[in-house]
């Protein structure tokens, strides 16, 4: 048996980007790591030229992780930089609740990173708070839209908000600029991931911008503050909609209704479909001005028919402990229309 080896030697001419040295200044950053790596591709048997990222022009590899606390000089040896992407992780944590309360941080991709010739895939902020002491509020520079099948996001990036507690499988949703969500309050540790979907993110980068603040602790898993536009229908969905709202979780929407408008609240199912093992699933719709509330037992009754609200109102959903396979997920919409009669 003769062993035959067939190989090819490829001499790569440095591309324009390879001649450049890029400075990534992470010296003022804390608890941050930046990874440049090959983006996943379908395996093919065809030979693909190497694609390397070099640190200080000396150490070259297909993957490179840069950590905070210093300045890094990097260069590329690659025929096609679209084969690489960047993933960044940054942790913002609070250990002393007295020091952190009301403190704010800007969740923005540093310009150094945006200027690199490699596409940013994910920039994740892990936001950690002392348990049962503080909660978090996310305030976007531009109001957000929740991505739903009925109204998908069509921007070049989205914010993916999920719980960062290992035991908790809770995904609040995907949000993009250009909607009606003014702020998102969350009870405990979360990760906020800015995910890009198109190279045009570079041009749209100015639309990104979230501020996170540490606020006094509250018991609900999440509170969405919604200020609908008169022009469009707002679609809102319960967190974890594909897997169902976690057991015994409560979420609320604070929906503002301008003085000259009427809000129509519509649910997209007749029944919630949840079957409870322990407790019951309830939805409470409460008028903020009069405090009058309507209570619906989601596991026993049909969902309400479209209702009209002349004043700001709350929608609160509290889950039971459901039987497997019969989970709670609700989609509803809010539409504003001008008031025809003054109903003060």
């Amino acid at each position: 048996g003769i062993l035959r080896l067939q190989f090819q030697v490829l001499v790569q001419h440095p591309q324009n980007e390879s001649n450049k040295i890029y400075v990534v200044d992470l010296s003022n950053e804390r608890a941050m790591s930046l990874t440049i790596e090959p983006r996943p591709v379908k395996q093919s048997r065809k030979f693909v030229p190497g694609c390397f990222v070099c640190l200080e022009s000396r150490t070259c590899s297909s993957n490179l992780t840069l950590t905070s606390g210093s300045k890094h000089k990097i260069s590329f040896l690659c025929d096609d930089l679209t084969r690489l992407w960047m993933n960044v992780e940054k942790t913002i944590s609070c250990t002393d609740h007295r020091y952190c309360q009301r403190k704010s941080y800007s969740l923005q991709v540093p310009s150094d990173i945006l200027h690199l010739p490699v596409e940013l895939h994910d920039f994740s902020w892990k936001l950690l708070v002392p348990k049962d002491r503080l909660s978090l509020v996310l305030v976007p520079a531009q109001k957000l839209q929740q991505h739903t099948h009925e109204k998908p996001c069509n921007t070049s990036f989205s914010y993916l908000v999920a719980s960062a507690i290992p035991s908790q499988d809770l995904y609040f949703g995907s949000f993009c600029p250009g909607g009606s969500i003014k702020q998102i309050q969350v009870k405990q540790n979360i990760s906020v991931t800015l995910r890009t979907f198109a190279p045009s993110f570079q041009q749209e980068a100015s639309r990104q911008g979230l501020t996170v603040s540490f606020i006094p602790y509250f018991k609900e898993e999440g509170v969405f503050t919604v200020t609908p536009d008169t022009k469009s229908k707002v679609y809102l969905r319960t967190p974890n909609w594909d897997r169902g709202l976690p057991s015994l979780t409560s979420v609320s929407w604070n929906i503002s209704v301008p003085r000259d408008q009427v809000a129509c609240l519509t649910f997209f199912k007749e029944r919630s479909g949840v079957v409870c093992q322990t407790g019951r699933a309830f939805m409470i719709i409460q008028e903020q001005r009069t405090r009058a509330e309507e209570i619906f037992s989601l596991d026993e009754d049909v969902l309400p028919k479209p209702s009209f609200h002349h004043h700001s109102f709350w929608v609160n959903i509290s889950n039971c402990s459901p039987t497997s396979g019969k989970q709670l997920d609700l989609l509803f919409s809010v539409t504003l229309t001008p008031r025809t009669v003054d109903l003060t």
């Epitope: 015994l248 407790g279 309830f282 209570i295 037992s297 026993e300």
Partner: antibody, heavy 126, light 107 residues
Framework: EVQLLESGGGLVQPGGSLRLSCAAS????????MNWVRQAPGKGLEWVSA????????YYADSVKGRFTISRDNSKNTLYLQMNSLRAEDTAVYYC???????????????????WGQGTTVTVSS | DIQLTQSPSFLSASVGDRVTITCRAS??????LAWYQQKPGKAPKLLIY???TLQGGVPSRFSGSGSGTEFTLTISSLQPEDFATYYC?????????FGQGTKVEIK
């Protein structure tokens, strides 16, 4: 003031029918599940039936299943109990009672009957 | 269906006495239990829900404890207005059932 007022009781022959009503006031009736509970002379309390706030779910004790029907008219703030094929053992004072909805240790549920009517007497006798 | 057994069925006590009534469930009901007080010719009154939570307006001499299958209602110092019949009721889904009752009489 939160109040429940039963009516419709009376004397009926075995095999006969009767319809009890319970008029509610002082609270948002449609928000709460409602119950019928009875008490035979000199005996203890017996839960009879319940209905969810929206009327979408109904529940019955085995002793009345198939004979009694609970219903509600939220526009009239009224709870009903239609009793058919009455037997001597159905003789009792019938109370309507409101379920309380409370959250206890993170679990929201019905946690007992916090408001009761004064009761209406049903006598089944020939 | 879940059966509830109360003990004792009758209890004679004096004003100032500490009184304990027991309620046993035929299967585990977590803390899904309520206690009611009923006086002759009157409708029952909710005293305690979720096994140990005192209903608003109920005097603090009443207390409840237990979980699973064994529950107790305690009156720390019996008052003249406490002579009545007491019922436990399970709240763990429908059908709901009551215990047979415990009559507290004056000794």
């Amino acid at each position: 003031e939160v109040q429940l007022l039963e009516s419709g009781g009376g004397l009926v022959q075995p095999g006969g029918s009767l319809r009890l009503s319970c008029a509610a006031s002082g609270f948002t009736f449609s928000n709460y599940a409602m119950n019928w509970v009875r008490q035979a002379p000199g005996k203890g309390l017996e839960w009879v039936s319940a209905i969810s706030g929206g009327g979408g779910s109904t529940y019955y004790a085995d002793s009345v299943k198939g004979r009694f029907t609970i219903s509600r008219d939220n526009s009239k703030n009224t709870l009903y109990l239609q009793m058919n094929s009455l037997r001597a053992e159905d003789t009792a004072v019938y109370y309507c009672a409101k379920e309380s909805i409370t959250m206890v240790r993170g679990v929201m549920d019905y946690y007992g009957m916090d408001v009761w009517g004064q009761g209406t007497t049903v006598t089944v006798s020939s | 269906d879940i059966q509830l057994t109360q003990s004792p069925s009758f209890l004679s006590a004096s004003v100032g006495d500490r009184v304990t009534i027991t309620c046993r469930a035929s299967q585990g009901i977590s803390s899904y239990l309520a206690w009611y007080q009923q006086k002759p010719g009157k409708a029952p009154k909710l005293l305690i829900y979720a096994a140990s939570t005192l209903q608003g307006g109920v005097p603090s001499r009443f207390s409840g404890s237990g979980s699973g299958t064994e529950f107790t209602l305690t009156i720390s110092s019996l008052q003249p207005e406490d002579f009545a019949t007491y019922y436990c009721q399970h709240l763990n889904r429908f059908p709901r059932t009551f215990g047979q009752g415990t009559k507290v009489e004056i000794k």
